[in-house]
């Protein structure tokens, strides 16, 4: 039975041209994490593998930075970066846990961070 939950940075906003950290935390399980995938809608942004380290998709190479931790830093944000982001935790023996983050990139200086929330 999958007992874990993923806590994410939730709904967040950031300014155009700035950067933002996407973070997820897997809790309430003793399952071993073997890999974390970061995706934007259907596109793979990055993979962090327990044995192989980081792989950043070539198309995002200049705007995505690995870390901190298993998180992902998005840089030089544009309005087109607005949308859903997913952290996908591959674990053994539980299987896959997915967390969702919604990022809104704003033109003005009214960006604020949303509250954390949990996804079972």
């Amino acid at each position: 039975m999958m007992t874990g939950t993923i806590e994410t940075t939730g709904n967040i906003s950031a300014e155009k041209g700035g950067s933002i950290i996407l973070q997820c935390h897997l809790s309430s399980t003793t399952a071993q994490v073997t890999q974390v995938n970061w995706e934007q809608q259907d596109q793979l942004l990055a993979i962090c593998n327990a044995d192989l380290g980081w792989h950043i998709s070539p198309s995002f190479k200049d705007r995505v930075a690995p870390g901190p931790g298993l998180g992902l830093t998005l840089q030089s944000l544009t309005v087109n970066d607005t949308g859903e982001y997913f952290c996908i935790y591959h674990t053994y023996p539980d299987g896959t846990y997915t967390g969702r983050i919604f990022l809104e990139v704003l033109e003005s200086s009214v960006a604020e961070h949303g509250a954390r929330f949990q996804i079972p």
């Epitope: 327990a50 192989l52 690995p66 870390g67 931790g69």
Partner: antibody, heavy 117, light 107 residues
């Protein structure tokens, strides 16, 4: 097995600059962040910043911006840190540390920097 | 910057004892906390990552717990080789920050 070999101790005059190295072996250099950490008896462990050799991207602690410059040479699997305008405050042990799936799982042995006036 | 507070600079213990080293973050860091052990003249070694996961090869007498702002490293059945300094670190946001360290000494 990953291994980080740092350059030897440095004794440098105040006002000068120094460049220390961290040679990585036993893993894919371009798949892990390389962090640099300063250790002094007074301030403990302080994070300076990191470089991701996969694309040369860097991220600095604001405190060390303009003081430290991080670079990497993927042909020799070596990360470098240059520290400029040296003062006695820069005397410390400097560590490089690998970070990927696990935080700071491999560290260099440290480079001792002594700044003399 | 997130401040990681290790309120005890020194802790006295005896071989066979159980000891708990605590660390408090100035804001929520989730479970992005690691614990390191450092012996004199050596570089730090990671013991615990993600607050509670033991790193490969670390003896099971080392246990990490906590989330949010309060974290604990527990060493059960302390051995003489455990006498060292222990640091917590948050890696939830930049700049990454460390606690000031807790030195474990013999009574």
């Amino acid at each position: 097995q990953a291994y980080l070999q740092q350059s030897g101790a440095e004794l440098v005059r105040s006002g000068a600059s120094v460049k220390m190295s961290c040679k990585a072996s036993g893993y894919t250099f371009t798949s892990y962040n390389m962090h640099w950490v300063k250790q002094t008896p007074g301030q403990g462990l302080e994070w300076i910043g990191y470089i991701y050799p996969g694309n040369g991207g860097t991220n600095y602690n604001q405190k060390f911006k303009g003081k430290a410059t991080l670079t990497a040479d993927t042909s020799s699997n070596t990360a470098y840190m240059q520290i400029s305008s040296l003062t006695s405050e820069d005397s410390a042990v400097y560590f490089c540390a690998r970070d990927g799936f696990y935080p700071f799982d491999y560290w260099g042995q440290g480079t001792t920097l002594t700044v003399s006036s | 910057d997130i401040v990681m507070t290790q309120s005890q600079k020194f802790m006295s213990t005896s071989v066979g004892d159980r000891v708990s080293v605590t660390c408090k973050a100035s804001q929520n860091v989730g479970t992005n906390v690691a614990w390191y052990q450092q012996k004199p003249g050596q570089s730090p070694k990671v013991l615990i990552y993600s607050a509670s996961y033991r790193y490969s090869g670390v003896p099971d007498r080392f246990t990490g717990s906590g989330s949010g702002t309060d974290f604990t490293l527990t060493i059960s059945n302390v051995q003489s080789e455990d006498l060292a300094e222990y640091f917590c670190q948050q890696y939830n946001s930049y700049p990454l920050t460390f606690g000031a360290g807790t030195k474990l000494e013999l009574k």
